[in-house]
């Protein structure tokens, strides 16, 4: 029986040209973390963490996906492309499959600011 | 006792392909992930390719990608290494390896089995 | 890809030296590193994993310090059968990478 869940950042926002870090973390199970897949909303791979062999990230995007904090995946240098949804799969053992869904939304810099001046505490 | 032994080395044309194997013993090796490592002659070691345990998870070192596929049948406790278009820096010494579980280091080695490219 | 330098390429030595070999990591890696040791003619020997824990049957004379970037391997006192070649070896990343060797000579 899955008891697990999966926790995210939400719906988050971020500046053109900035970073984002993209957190999710699987809360009261004490299944065994065997992979995290991270995916686009195109359903891209960004990268994977395996426990076995560490991070890979997809030649795509290796430029501009940091691993971390945890497993965590910071999204750097970023596009207006970026905009939508991100997900973190996370294979476990006994449990099976959970997964997360977080989405972001990339302003234009002024945006941003002007957005993050207003935001209720 | 924990044991790997490789085969299938030998010299080979450039362009060519040779299958080397890698017989497990005294482990379970269904549930364990392997991995190939070659060295060049008087040179270091270089990761080449790694298979999870159900023969999924499959990865590759950039000079291999595309040309290498490891696969491995878990009935007969056989890992192989499948080398297409062999070129002449794939000359080496190979080895199969077994990491220790979820602590990333490999801790059984075969005694290697050499491949030698040349015309 | 992730670049390991080692330092230094080889080493001269006498028995019951202390010998430091160090690994540099070209980004961090937390302690995801390992050391190995290499005779000639055989097939390596995991020393070391996760930066320091020490591989079961290695003699303790032999330990693993740092994270992130810097690591190094210590070797208390040199005994004989230490004379051979070593390695670090990284798995934060795929595709791990090995670093180019120290070669730990008589002196």
């Known amino acids: 029986m899955m008891t697990g869940t999966i926790e995210t950042t939400g719906n988050i926002s971020a500046k053109k040209g900035g970073s984002v870090i993209l957190q999710c973390h699987l809360s009261s199970t004490m299944a065994q973390v065997t992979q995290v897949n991270w995916e686009q909303h195109d359903h891209s791979l960004l990268a994977i963490r395996n426990a076995e062999l560490g991070w890979h990230i997809y030649p795509a995007f290796k430029d501009r996906v940091a691993p971390g904090p945890g497993l965590g995946l910071t999204l750097q240098s970023l596009t207006m492309n970026d905009t939508g949804e991100y997900f973190c799969t996370y294979h476990t053992y006994p449990d099976g499959t959970y997964r997360g869904r977080i989405f972001l939304e990339v302003l234009e810099s002024s945006v941003a600011e002007h957005s993050a001046r207003f935001q209720i505490p | 006792q924990v044991q790997l032994v490789e085969s299938g080395g030998g010299v080979v044309q450039p362009g060519r392909s040779l299958r080397l194997s890698c017989a497990a013993s005294g482990f379970t090796f269904s549930s364990s992930y392997m991995h190939w490592v070659r060295q060049a002659p008087g040179k270091g070691l270089e990761w080449v390719a790694v298979?999870?345990?159900?023969?999924?998870?499959?990865y590759y070192a950039d000079s291999v990608e595309g040309r290498f596929t490891i696969s491995r049948d878990n009935s007969k406790n056989t890992l192989y290494l499948q080398m297409n278009s062999l070129r002449a820096e794939d000359t080496a010494l190979y080895y199969c390896a077994k990491p220790v579980p979820r602590r990333r280091g490999l801790d059984v080695w075969g005694q290697g089995t050499m491949v030698t490219v040349s015309s | 890809d992730i670049q390991l330098t080692q330092s230094p390429s080889s080493v001269s030595a006498s028995v019951g030296d202390r010998v430091t070999i160090t690994c540099r990591a070209s980004q961090g890696i937390s302690s995801w590193l390992a050391w190995y040791q290499q005779k000639p003619g055989k097939a390596p020997k995991l020393l070391i994993y996760g930066a320091s824990s020490l591989q079961s049957g290695v003699p303790s004379r032999f330990s693993g310090s740092g994270s992130g970037t810097d690591f190094t391997l210590t070797i208390s006192s040199l005994q004989p059968e230490d004379f051979a070649t070593y390695y670090c070896?990284?798995?934060?990343?795929?595709?791990?990478?090995f670093g180019g060797g120290t070669k730990v000579e008589i002196k």
């Open positions: 298979i999870g345990a159900d023969g999924s998870n499959k």
């Open positions: 070896q990284q798995a934060f990343y795929l595709p791990w990478t």
